[in-house]
Interface confidence: low
């Protein structure tokens, strides 16, 4: 590696992939293992970020690079950069403090992540039920009971009561 | 003893520019490298931008992209962060934040950065 030449910052020379080692005289050491430096000249290289317990490896570390993680199967990512693995519930369910419980009654999530969501009120754009909604499902809605041709009908929205074994949350 | 002070924040109206500065003391601010992060009520910390020690390397997140530029005075130990074109959706506490030497994270994340100054408020309406 070469030795720096600029007055000003002898480190400005050094490229991606090495540090301006101070210990030797500002000369241009390369990383070493299991470290990087993504910018030239810099005065340290970063240690590689490793993906460790439920982080796993979708590029390994260069030493110009950062390792990138992603979450092994049954655990999503959260945050920039991959920082956080959150655990999968079914589809239907949602996580809670206690783990993955069931979307209650109304409510539906069609992910194996995030919250259940309420069905949505066809009534409130004037429109029926078309299909009813499930725990994995948002209801379908359908024309507005006006707009159906006679002898027509559509499907009755269900009595507001809860499943069995379905408490609130 | 490491200390971030930020400054320059206020209250501005759409379309509208304000500069923020980071004055650092009490450590070799000129080998680190800093970056902007901003909280608005109820969410979560957000990366803005990120400078390399030396100016080397600059990143931003998309949606200021063109907008805000970062950059700094080594000699004068400070930071600056030039906003423009300034949205409603920027209105936020603003922080500078030192990088750590050694970080397992991607630069985006708060993770990565070990002090940070105590925020300057930025208010953007009409």
């Known amino acids: 590696f070469e030795r720096t030449r600029s007055l000003q910052d002898p480190c400005s020379n050094c490229p991606a992939g090495t540090f301006c080692d101070n210990n030797r005289n500002q000369i241009c050491s390369p990383c070493p293992p299991n470290s990087f430096s993504s910018a030239g000249g810099q005065r340290t290289c970063d240690i590689c970020r490793q993906c460790k317990g439920v982080f796993r490896t979708r590029k390994e570390c260069s030493s110009t690079s950062n390792a990138e993680c992603d979450c092994t199967p049954g655990f999503h990512c959260l945050g920039a950069g991959c920082s956080m693995c959150e655990q999968d519930c079914k589809q239907g369910q949602e996580l809670t403090k206690k783990g993955c419980k069931d979307c209650c009654f109304g409510t539906f999530n069609d992910q194996k992540r995030g919250i259940c969501r309420p069905w949505t009120n066809c009534s409130l754009d004037g429109k029926s039920v078309l299909v009813n909604g499930t725990k994995e499902r948002d209801v379908v809605c359908g024309p507005s009971p006006a707009d159906l041709s006679p002898g027509a009908s559509s499907v009755t929205p269900p009595a507001p009561a809860r499943e069995p074994g379905h408490s609130p949350q | 003893e490491v200390q971030l002070l930020e400054s320059g924040g206020g209250e501005v109206q759409p379309g509208g520019s304000l500069r923020l500065s980071c004055a650092a003391s009490g450590w070799a601010f000129g080998n680190y490298g800093m970056a902007w992060f901003r909280q608005a009520p109820g969410k979560e910390r957000e990366f803005v931008s990120r400078?390399?020690?030396?100016?080397?390397?600059?990143d931003y997140v998309e949606s200021v992209k063109g907008r805000f530029t970062i950059s700094r005075d080594n000699a004068k130990n400070t930071l600056y962060l030039q906003m423009s074109s300034l949205r409603a959706e920027d209105t936020a506490v603003y922080y500078c934040?030192?990088?750590?030497?050694?970080?397992?994270?991607?630069?985006?994340?708060?993770?990565?950065?070990?002090?940070w100054g105590q925020g300057t408020l930025v208010t953007v309406k009409p």
């Open positions: 934040a030192r990088q750590r030497s050694y970080s397992r994270y991607d630069i985006r994340t708060p993770q990565t950065y070990d002090y």
């Open positions: 400078l390399a020690w030396n100016g080397g390397s600059t």
